[in-house]
């Protein structure tokens, strides 16, 4: 059963990739992205079923085509580089799903656009959050 | 104080076109992404278009894309939008809007011009 | 596209009443609303951005709150200046959209 602790960490982490994941969608969606008609061209897949902590492989497994996209944006738009942002991102989601659990994602039929995809994971953060507290 | 003056609307024929202006006054207008948004009679608002503060982007509602262009002249500070093949169903007032941040989406649109009517009819 | 659904249509209230408006948007859209307050023959007002956040110049009976797909504009204390139509609007993806509107009247 987990501990207090383990679920404060568990908590603490989601927050993070929350964060990151907001900082994202704010760093592309807004007026200032020159780039984002060029984004938006872009398709992610997107989970068939995200409710545990297990349906994150399927955003680890979309991480390296969000780095791809988000090399467009202007590096003022974030505070690290792409590389270094889904890095942290990629430590953060391996500690979270486990990695000695093996789960073979499934996806909807329709893909998405990086808005609808983050947006759909920043759901899943705060859906996990909002059960833990 | 910062205002939007939209003109250019009136009657017009099916198929017909029609330019409409904003202009702005008392802010920054190179530095905004600028809107339209349509309201028809006795019917719910309905965004139409927006632009970035340099033109770089431009998106549309489907029901107007390859019909509707709109545009901007940051030295005139004055807000587009050209109406080709105009159906009756473009029938609405019209209204250009400012975002209310410079950058972020979720401030919404904070100032609006009075509207000008666009009657399409034959 | 998103689209959003307002309930009620339309509701009659006294001056003094607590109302309340809600809006459901197709997907999650975090925390990307808007609500924009208008009376006829006028332009659209601005009330609350970022779901919850008050714009300047708004009364504070004005209030928002909500996020992902259900959101909820309350007006703790209906004032005469009061009665207009409240739409919603989703700010996340373009094409935004509006709700349908609510109309707030007399009762």
């Known amino acids: 059963a987990p501990t207090s602790s383990s679920t404060k960490k568990t908590q603490l982490q989601l927050e993070h990739l929350l964060l990151d994941l907001q900082m994202i969608l704010n760093g592309i969606n807004n007026y200032k992205n020159p780039k984002l008609t060029r984004m938006l061209t872009f398709k992610f897949y997107m989970p068939k079923k995200a409710t545990e902590l297990k349906h994150l492989q399927c955003l680890e497994e979309e991480l390296k085509p969000l780095e791809e996209v988000l090399n467009l944006a202007q590096s003022k738009n974030f505070h690290l580089r792409p590389r270094d942002l889904i890095s942290n991102i990629n430590v953060i989601v391996l500690e979270l799903k486990g990695s000695e659990t093996t789960f073979m994602c499934e996806y909807a039929d329709e893909t998405a656009t990086i808005v609808e995809f983050l947006n759909r994971w920043i759901t899943f953060c705060q859906s996990i959050i909002s059960t833990l507290t | 104080q910062v205002q939007l003056v939209e003109s250019g609307g009136g009657v017009v024929q099916p198929g017909r076109s029609l330019r409409l202006s904003c202009a702005a006054s008392?802010?920054?207008?190179?530095?905004?992404?600028m809107h339209w948004v349509r309201q028809a009679p006795g019917k719910g608002l309905e965004w139409v278009a927006v632009i970035w503060y340099d033109g770089s982007n431009k998106f549309y509602v489907d029901s107007v894309k390859g019909r509707f262009t709109i545009s901007r002249d940051n030295s005139k500070n004055t807000l587009y939008l050209q109406m080709n093949s105009l159906r009756a169903e473009d029938t609405a007032v019209y209204y250009c809007a400012r975002p209310g941040s410079d950058y972020y989406f979720y401030y919404g649109m904070d100032v609006w011009g009075q509207g000008t009517t666009v009657t399409v009819s034959s | 596209d998103i689209q959003m659904t307002q309930s009620p249509s339309s509701v009659s209230a006294s001056v003094g009443d607590r109302v309340t408006i809600t809006c459901r948007a197709s997907?999650?859209?975090?925390?990307?609303l808007v609500w924009y307050q208008q009376k006829p023959g006028k332009p659209p007002k601005l009330l609350i951005y970022a779901a919850s956040s008050l714009q300047n110049g708004v009364p504070s009976r004005f209030s928002g709150s909500g996020s992902g797909t259900d959101f909820t504009l309350t007006i703790s204390s209906l004032q005469t200046e009061d009665f207009a139509t409240y739409y919603c609007q989703q700010a996340l993806s373009f094409p935004w959209t509006f709700g349908p509107g609510t109309k707030v009247e007399v009762k």
């Open positions: 997907q999650g859209i975090s925390n990307w």
């Open positions: 008392g802010f920054t207008f190179s530095s905004y992404g």
